[in-house]
Interface confidence: low
Amino acid sequence: NLSQDDSQPWTSDETVVAGGTVVLKCQVKDHEDSSLQWSNPAQQTLYFGEKRALRDNRIQLVSSTPHELSISISNVALADEGEYTCSIFTMPVRTAKSLVTVLGIPQKPIITGYKSSLREKETATLNCQSSGSKPAAQLTWRKGDQELHGDQTRIQEDPNGKTFTVSSSVSFQVTREDDGANIVCSVNHESLKGADRSTSQRIEVLYTPTAMIRPEPAHPREGQKLLLHCEGRGNPVPQQYVWVKEGSEPPLKMTQESALIFPFLNKSDSGTYGCTATSNMGSYTAYFTLNVNDPSPVPSSSSTYH
């Protein structure tokens, strides 16, 4: 004796990404000489056994046997979501339901709000937005490989009533180390299956210059030629360099871009030299003590910031 359940068809719920393909499989143990049928959420018959009932080329027969009816729906749209019904026309009619969930793929995020030429210690505020996700996606921020804590993701329903637009903002105080950094907004969603979908915004940070003095050669002796290079750093890179010698009339003559040249060193060149590197962000003075009597000039540790 067959139990009543042997004539009860069974199926499973399916989740599919928009644009993908879903397979609906319905099985029954005892078909009682009846055919299986699939119908859509609008109660339109799709297949009755191996016979196509709806003219939709996206819907194809996968398998039709007395115990199984499997069909595939390709290029699935959001509108295809809903409960699909497998029926077997025994007495009484028995049915099984398959809930098809269609995931909306979030669009590549868009970053707005970047103001160019941020100054050090100013606050950068960036906004990120992505449309088309279903269910609503999550947005995350990072600076390089460091996570940034943006505000909670805001969710707004798209005009189609099915998908969502998500947005998030992040604010942080910039430092000189952030110059050239990439701020990345990533969208996280089950439809992406771990794939990266992100947008980056490279930021520029303006900061005050620093400078240091490098002798060439490193250990000059009396009678040698000496170049004192003034190496300025900053954004923008310092464009103006002024050399002074303590106790002398400023400024000293400069050659070879930012370098001070001594064609033939003598003891009277001994003393403390200062180089002021200037950009439109400010100035910085580095000092160097030159002792021609000593074959190893020692850079002083003092430097002055303006």
Epitope: G144, D145, R176, E177, D179, G180, A181, N182, R202, M212, R214, H229, E231, G232, R233, G234, N235, V237
Partner: nanobody, 124 residues
Framework: QVQLVESGGGLVQPGGSLRLSCAAS????????RGWFRQAPGKGREFVAA????????NYADSAKGRFTISRDNSKNTVYLQMNSLRAEDTAVYYC?????????????????WGQGTLVTVSS
């Protein structure tokens, strides 16, 4: 955050060659200068070579001129140091460094980020 990883060191005979690599991660290092320094046992850290962000400007210590070549591949965020005609006095730990600026520097104080170093031993 910022990571510089050197590789390519090892044992080589005098007159031999090695190519060191320095891979960067954690920020867009292609826009910044990069330098190689070395530190021999019992000695201070010494400048070897530097290259600017574009690769258009390079500088070498006197001890490296004519034998060492610094280059960079910004698409891989990697800087290389090709070392030829190696001598016993080149034995040292070689460090890759990056400054937080677009200008190459020749002094260790001018660099903000440092790798862990790779050992180069020149010996017969």
């Amino acid at each position: 955050q910022v990571q510089l990883v050197e590789s390519g060191g090892g044992l080589v005979q005098p007159g031999g060659s090695l190519r060191l690599s320095c891979a960067a991660s954690g920020r867009t290092f292609s826009n910044y200068a990069r330098g190689w320094f070395r530190q021999a046992p019992g000695k201070g850290r010494e400048f070897v070579a530097a290259i600017d962000y574009s690769g258009g400007s390079t500088n070498y210590a006197d001890s490296a001129k004519g034998r060492f070549t610094i280059s960079r591949d910004n698409s891989k965020n990697t800087v290389y140091l090709q070392m030829n005609s190696l001598r016993a006095e080149d034995t040292a730990v070689y460090y890759c460094a990056a400054p937080a600026s677009r200008r190459p520097s020749w002094d260790a104080d001018g660099y903000d980020y440092w790798g862990q170093g790779t050992l180069v031993t020149v010996s017969s």
